[in-house]
């Protein structure tokens, strides 16, 4: 949950308000209470945003882009509150807003700078392309341009590919990293400096497991304490890589504490889940269960990927029958 907007106070009657795309914000303005209150909000000194005088709104010449998106705190005007409630901000709303307040006593003018940020939750994906393995950190919509950093075994990596596409109001960014043949752990951080919001993706490959047919395998998946906050909503998904694509075996939603299992041989330990341990068991292994198993723990602030490689070998009996 984020605040409606946050203010940064700067000198000369000017404040900076930071809002999020499509969310509501408040442009603050206060004055010394008095009678005969007149309030005019303008954008870039040209466009009429909102006018109030003689006890009511006068929106006849309001710029169409603000229609049905602005209101004042009418019960608070007599107490010196001229703040503007602004609905569903877009990146086109960025800029300088001027609040003119006139009363029987004085006239004051306040300036508010509105900055709008976008940060749709990023994702970290693990992909196989032919014989290569890639980690991809991507964010579908972000503004302003974020800072993306990669680390390998906690050491920053200078090589940082960024595929960027810009739309009218935000960027879409992919940052792929080739990790073919690597057993290292990787971390990708995407930071939106305006919204002061950081997302981290972490990828860990576990040692390969060799199992015999008909046995069961236990695969560990425990969140790293640095990122994990049990109070925050998150989702855990176990998937298996089959011919280049992942199929979901099971998932768990923390908000509802629901577990959905798509593979009858898959089991989760409820006791362990309550202790934030999402390790799983797969029973009665067969040869086709060989492959990569991915545990994905995701929230708004992080994605933790754990990869297990399982090799299922024929049992002695099966081998002797052949």
């Amino acid at each position: 949950i984020f605040p409606l907007a946050f203010f940064i106070y700067v000198p000369m009657n000017e404040q900076i308000v930071i809002g999020r795309l499509d969310e509501d914000i408040i442009l603050p303005s206060s004055f010394e209470r008095g009678s005969e209150v007149v309030i005019h909000w303008k954008y870039q000194d040209s466009y009429k945003v909102h006018s109030y005088y003689k006890g009511s709104d006068h929106l006849e010449s309001q710029d169409p882009r603000y229609a049905n998106r602005t209101s004042l705190f009418y019960n608070e005007i007599q107490n010196g509150n001229a703040s503007l409630f602004f609905r569903r901000v877009s990146l086109l709303d960025e800029g300088i807003y001027t609040c003119y307040v006139g009363t029987a006593i004085q006239v004051i003018t306040n300036k508010v700078v509105l900055k709008v940020g976008v940060f749709l939750t990023p994702v970290m994906k693990y992909e196989k392309r032919n014989t290569n393995s890639f980690l991809i950190c991507s964010v579908l919509s972000v503004y302003p341009r974020p800072i993306i950093t990669w680390k390998m075994d906690n050491t920053p990596i200078s090589e940082n590919n960024m595929e960027e596409t810009g739309s009218l109001d935000s960027f879409s960014i992919n940052s792929p990293l080739n990790i073919t043949g690597s057993n290292s752990s990787y971390e990708c951080t995407i930071e939106n400096s305006l919204l002061k919001q950081t997302w981290t993706g972490r990828w860990t490959m576990k040692d390969g497991l060799h199992k015999m047919q008909s046995e069961h395998v236990s695969l560990s998946c425990q969140p790293v304490n640095d990122y994990f906050s049990p109070n925050q909503d998150f989702k855990v998904t176990w998937s298996r890589m089959k011919s280049g694509t992942f199929s979901v075996l099971a998932y768990y939603l923390s908000s509802s504490q629901n577990t959905i299992i798509n593979e009858s041989r898959f089991s989760w330990n409820k006791e362990l889940i309550n202790q934030s341990d999402f390790s799983m068991n797969l029973m009665d292994l067969n040869l086709s269960d060989s492959g990569e198993y991915l545990c994905n723990i995701s929230s708004d602030e992080y994605t933790l990927l754990t990869i297990h490689t399982v090799h299922v070998e024929p049992s002695q009996e099966t081998a002797s029958h052949n």
Partner: antibody, heavy 121, light 107 residues
Framework: QVQLVESGGGVVQPGRSLRLSCAAS????????IHWVRQAPGKGLEWVAV????????YYADSVRGRFTISRDNSKNTLSLQMNSLRVEDTAVYYC??????????????WGQGTLVTVSS | DIQMTQSPSTLSASVGDRVTITCRAS??????LAWYQQKPGKAPKLLIY???SLESGVPSRFSGSGSGTEFTLTISSLQPDDLATYYC?????????FGQGTKLEIK
């Protein structure tokens, strides 16, 4: 102290033009709406026009709409009234008057001393 | 346009008298009414705004009342300096309109 000084009045023939000016001092001119109000000799007061503090809005009385144009120069603290197609009934003392605030309130807190316009053939 | 009608047109009173001037609007103007005083050869001066609010610097013997369509200006104790013409003005909507004026004479 607040001062409004009108100038530009005089005698003019019907159908001709005249430009009145109002010089403001003693307050932040760009914060206030300014009106023109006129008074025919021996008659009552008649509101003529208003221009808002930022020049964004201008309103006129029906009797002058289309003939008179109000304007302001906030950098020079001056207000103007361009009067075209003048009629005998436009003869009056023309006052510039400051609004309570932006121009939206519509009453007159400070007045100039007035300038006389006489339209006569 | 909203018509404003003042009565009486002329009023003669003595120093110390309580004087009342009435103003009627042709339609409701809430409390958006101002009163002005104009002395001979001078510009008008604001006395009252919003029907009953006394403008700063105006003597307290002046008061206003009313709302809707009926308004009054009262001078509680007439002074020689109050010789003037008094105008009401509605500022509910454009075009702003004045009453025809009430000329106050001192007996």
């Amino acid at each position: 102290q607040v001062q409004l000084v009108e100038s530009g009045g005089g005698v003019v023939q019907p159908g001709r033009s005249l430009r009145l000016s109002c010089a403001a001092s003693g307050f932040t001119f760009s914060d206030y709406g300014i009106h023109w109000v006129r008074q025919a000799p021996g008659k009552g007061l008649e509101w003529v026009a208003v221009i808002w503090y930022d020049g964004s809005d201008k309103y006129y009385a029906d009797s002058v709409r289309g003939r008179f144009t109000i304007s302001r120069d906030n950098s020079k603290n001056t207000l103007s009234l361009q009067m075209n197609s003048l009629r005998v009934e436009d003869t009056a003392v023309y006052y510039c008057a400051r609004d309570r605030s932006s121009g939206a309130m519509g009453y007159f807190v400070y007045w100039g001393q007035g300038t006389l316009v006489t339209v006569s053939s | 346009d909203i018509q404003m009608t003042q009565s009486p047109s002329t009023l003669s009173a003595s120093v110390g008298d309580r004087v009342t001037i009435t103003c009627r609007a042709s339609q409701s103007i809430s409390s958006w009414l101002a009163w002005y005083q104009q002395k001979p050869g001078k510009a008008p001066k604001l006395l009252i705004y919003k029907a009953s609010s006394l403008e700063s610097g105006v003597p307290s013997r002046f008061s206003g009342s009313g709302s809707g369509t009926e308004f009054t200006l009262t001078i509680s104790s007439l002074q020689p300096d109050d010789l003037a013409t008094y105008y009401c003005q509605q500022y509910q909507s454009y075009s702003y309109t004045f009453g025809q004026g009430t000329k106050l004479e001192i007996k």
